[in-house]
């Protein structure tokens, strides 16, 4: 058992059929000796007396807000939480495995530079009674300081019979240096509380690994004198690192018809323009990737060719 | 929301078997950890066994051990209540539960509930 924050307690269960369960002792916080009795939630059924209470946990239900009374007046609480394990692995109930980019993968983060600055998000079809704290550091054995806000729900969705929703938190790390080669990794840590259920999740990643430009801004079309061709142009998102001469970008261009069906050109380079056939009702769209690290590709910035 | 209906009760003599099945509708069912619970006339609800939503765990009162077996068909959105060698104080109406706590044998826990349905054991 331990204290995840004041008055709430957390038991590890090592949970099988006619497991013994896990023996835990509640004492009192108070200087009170005598006349001191326990009860569960709100039963008005007494559990024990005196200033301690030793309980059998074999169940949630044996979890819940253990409150210690006197004379008709409460002295103190213990909420107990259950963190289970079944067949040597904790539970993962509460989210949903996202399996991008492979299975098990509970949290998702992204960056938008090298700022240190990242945003990480997790999905649950559990719409009541469910809170989460979030806390991160750089490195874990000698860590240093990442700052994260309050996890919000971010969107909701409908997936088949199902309604999903998605959580997000936005990280800050205290002293980054975007320039710096990283040797520890990001670690993010999430407490996830369900009714009387505990889970926590974990992700680890290297800031390099999760960057994800913005789409290019401002892409443009000057259409070529006499010629089927166009002048696309762009320029680098607001939000990504500077300066461009040392965080540089590289970038896709695609010609795509109408028709999924198709045939797509593309365009490689590292210019914020480029020269292509501009077919009748096709779209020229435009997306970014770090020029020197291979990590994900940007939305697609699109314009009409018409 | 999800909607249970139990189904399969009946009156059967001492010793016999019945299957009971409770029909999910609404929500996702495989959300859901899902408990049979029973009520005999001027008695608390009382505990009978659960199974977690992937239907790879079970977990019993000790009057149900050995005795009843609880399965679920997460394609069918159904889960069901084997019993056998039955007893005349088995004599209930049996509900289904559906909740997010596994193992729980406290019916609080359990958040959607169905109408239940009659067994008479006689002997």
């Known amino acids: 058992i331990w204290e995840l924050k004041k008055d709430v307690y957390v038991v590890e269960l090592d949970w099988y059929p006619d497991a013994p369960g896990e023996m835990v002792v509640l004492t009192c916080d108070t200087p009170e000796e005598d006349g001191i009795t326990w009860t569960l939630d709100q039963s008005s059924e007494v559990l024990g007396s005196g200033k301690t209470l030793t309980i059998q946990v074999k169940e949630f239900g044996d979890a819940g807000q253990y409150t210690c009374h006197k004379g008709g007046e409460v002295l103190s609480h213990s909420l107990l939480l259950l963190h289970k394990k079944e067949d040597g692995i904790w539970s993962t109930d509460i989210l949903k495995d996202q399996k991008e980019p492979k299975n098990k993968t509970f949290l998702r983060c992204e960056a938008k530079n090298y700022s240190g600055r990242f945003t990480c998000w997790w999905l649950t079809t559990i719409s009541t009674d469910l809170t989460f704290s979030v806390k991160s550091s750089r490195g874990s054995s000698d860590p240093q300081g990442v700052t994260c806000g309050a996890a919000t729900l971010s969107a909701e969705r409908v997936r088949g019979d199902n309604k999903e929703y998605e959580y997000s938190v936005e990280c800050q790390e205290d002293s980054a240096c975007p320039a710096a080669e990283e040797s520890l990794p990001i670690e993010v840590m999430v407490d996830a509380v369900h009714k009387l259920k505990y889970e926590n999740y974990t992700s680890s990643f290297f800031i390099r690994d999760i960057i994800k430009p913005d789409p290019p801004k401002n892409l443009q079309l000057k259409p070529l004198k006499n010629s089927r061709q166009v002048e696309v142009s762009w320029e680098y998102p607001d939000t990504w690192s500077t300066p461009h001469s040392y965080f540089s970008l590289t970038f896709c261009v695609q010609v795509q018809g109408k028709s999924k069906r198709e045939k797509k050109d593309r365009v490689f380079t590292d210019k914020t323009s480029a020269t292509v056939i501009c077919r009748k009702n096709a779209s020229i769209s435009v997306r970014a990737q770090d020029r020197y690290y291979s990590s994900s590709w940007s939305e697609w910035a699109s314009v009409p060719c018409s | 929301e999800v909607q249970l209906v139990e189904s399969g009760g009946g009156v059967v003599q001492a010793g016999e078997s019945l299957r009971l099945s409770c029909a999910a509708s609404?929500?996702?069912?495989?959300?859901?950890?899902m408990g049979w619970f029973r009520q005999a006339p001027g008695t608390e609800r009382e505990f009978v066994g659960a199974?977690?939503?992937?239907?790879?765990?079970?977990y019993y009162a000790d009057s149900a051990k050995g005795r009843f077996t609880i399965s679920r068909d997460n394609a069918k959105n159904t889960v069901f209540l084997q019993m056998s060698s039955l007893k005349p104080e088995d004599t209930a109406v049996y509900y289904c539960a559906a909740g997010w706590l596994f193992p729980s044998s406290r019916s609080r826990d359990y958040d959607y509930w169905g109408q239940g349905t009659q067994v008479t054991v006689s002997s």
């Open positions: 199974i977690n939503r992937r239907g790879s765990s079970t």
């Open positions: 609404g929500r996702s069912f495989s959300n859901y950890e």
